[in-house]
């Protein structure tokens, strides 16, 4: 699958959105008739690709959104598509990768000014442990960049996931970023689709590990929108 390509040791610890979404490619995404969105992921490769059908964004992986893959935007056929990176065109916040939101039709970074007024709201979403809210994001990985030091272990200071050892990602802990473990199968992964909400994460989580994506836990499908539990699940 695409996810295993992205998270394999060939591209060490390359998380979405660095390598695009962990899930399903969106080389031609159209959220509205007549608007064609070119693929936002230069690392995307298709390997026995199986599209994941969806009706809403919450049914897709953390770094995906739900839309029609065709130019016509036929609402009857929707699948999970790769989130859109910074400076790419968008129609709604869910289309943008973690750390970004949709502003004036473009995915832009959630800047630090979003933090102050909405801290309490974020904390209340917490499950109450160190890695308790919201999924992590990280920056582009420069594959050719020099190895300037040994990769960071859990708790080490980082700026992007390539600073961390294999099996770890770079995610916020309060107001700084540290290396945290990539999530394993069955572990809780929180999804959020509020404007700029990726920028509010006090305790970011890593993305789901190889071969996994963040989806609604099956027995929680009937629960209310606000309380549905997402976990890392096999494709």
């Amino acid at each position: 699958t695409l996810n295993s390509v992205l998270n394999s040791n060939a591209i060490k610890n390359l998380p979405p959105p660095l390598g695009g979404a962990a899930g399903h490619p969106g080389s031609a995404v159209s959220a509205a008739p007549g608007i064609l969105y070119p693929g936002g992921n230069k690392y995307q490769t298709i390997d026995n690709y199986q599209p994941y059908p969806c009706a809403e964004d919450e049914e897709c992986g953390t770094d995906e959104y739900c839309a029609s893959p065709t130019r016509g935007g036929d609402a009857g056929v929707q699948i999970c598509l790769a989130c859109r990176k910074r400076r790419k065109r968008c129609m709604r916040h869910a289309m943008c990768c973690p750390g970004n939101y949709c502003k004036n039709g473009i995915c832009v970074s959630s800047d630090q000014n979003h933090f102050r007024g909405e801290i309490e709201e974020t904390i209340t979403e917490s499950f109450g442990n160190d890695h308790s809210t919201l999924d992590g994001y990280s920056r582009r990985t420069t594959l050719s960049s020099k190895m300037y030091h040994t990769k960071g272990q859990e708790g080490s200071v980082c700026l992007r996931s390539s600073d961390c050892a294999s099996g770890l990602c770079c995610a916020r802990h309060f107001w700084s970023k540290i290396c945290k473990p990539v999530l394993k199968e069955g572990q809780v992964c929180t999804k959020h689709r509020r404007k700029g909400s990726h920028g509010l994460e006090i305790f970011q989580r890593c993305y789901c590990g190889e071969g996994l994506s963040c989806r609604i836990q099956k027995d929680h499908h009937q629960a209310s929108n606000s309380s549905r539990l997402h976990t890392c699940q096999r494709h």
């Epitope: 910074r86 970074s109 800047d111 630090q112 933090f115 160190d130 920056r139 582009r140 420069t142 960049s145 300037y148 030091h149 960071g152 272990q153 859990e154 708790g155 080490s156 200071v157 980082c158 700026l159 992007r160 390539s162 600073d163 916020r172 802990h173 309060f174 107001w175 700084s176 970023k177 540290i178 290396c179």
Partner: antibody, heavy 117, light 107 residues
Framework: EVQLQQSGPELVKPGASVKIFCKTS????????MHWVKQTHGKSLEWIGG????????SYNQKFKGKATLTVDKSSSTACMELRSLTSEDSTVYYC??????????WGQGTSVTVSP | ETTVTQSPASLSMAIGEKVTIRCITS??????MNWYQQKPGEPPKLLIS???TLRPGVPSRFSSSGYGTDFVFTIENMLSEDVADYYC?????????FGGGTKLEIK
């Protein structure tokens, strides 16, 4: 009010070690990484490394590995940098600086280290 | 490691003039550039942080722009109190790297 108070100037002999302290107040110490920066006599700045007090995790600039060791004392909200095997090239001003979402927003007043026989 | 090249090294400007300082990075750093002011005997002061965000309490005559590898810091109408050294700092990747600094003086 956020404050970073650094220890006083140090005069040390070549080959010796020195510890510089950075006592913090006005914020929750464990919530921000602490960076250390070297400024060579009014010239440019160099990042030495950073330590996150939550688990004591560090990251160093390769250039300062073996030269600097970063630690924290959570009970006193104090960060510490030890510099060892000092030479004249280490004679300069060192700053601690608090991390805020990637930027270094509050800085200590600086500690001058002079290495002299 | 990302190298940050800052220019000019020194600048002599008249009061009221527009000041422009440039930093170029060796790798694409998105908009993860910060700008500092340092006066003699003082630590650096953060003026503008990632995303060209003016820090609270910093006068609006200071601004910055840029994305990717090319960044510009501007003082719209220079005042005597702006005499200082100015540094850029990239915070996209470790190790953090600073520009070489610009010494701003009054003409």
């Amino acid at each position: 009010e956020v404050q970073l108070q650094q220890s006083g100037p140090e005069l040390v002999k070549p080959g010796a070690s020195v510890k510089i302290f950075c006592k913090t107040s006005g914020y929750t110490f464990t919530e921000n990484t602490m960076h250390w920066v070297k400024q060579t006599h009014g010239k440019s700045l160099e990042w030495i490394g950073g330590i996150n007090p939550h688990k004591g995790g560090t990251s160093y600039n390769q250039k300062f590995k073996g030269k600097a060791t970063l630690t924290v004392d959570k009970s006193s909200s104090t960060a510490c940098m030890e510099l060892r095997s000092l030479t004249s090239e280490d004679s300069t001003v060192y700053y601690c600086a608090r991390d805020w979402l990637g930027a270094m927003d509050y800085w200590g007043q600086g500690t001058s280290v002079t290495v002299s026989p | 490691e990302t190298t940050v090249t800052q220019s000019p090294a020194s600048l002599s400007m008249a009061i009221g003039e527009k000041v422009t300082i440039r930093c170029i990075t060796s790798t694409d750093i998105d908009d993860d550039m910060n700008w500092y002011q340092q006066k003699p005997g003082e630590p650096p002061k953060l003026l503008i942080s990632e995303g060209n965000t003016l820090r609270p309490g910093v006068p609006s005559r200071f601004s910055s722009s840029g994305y990717g590898t090319d960044f510009v810091f501007t003082i719209e109408n220079m005042l005597s109190e702006d005499v200082a050294d100015y540094y850029c700092l990239q915070s996209d990747n470790l190790p953090y790297t600073f520009g070489g600094g610009t010494k701003l003086e009054i003409k």
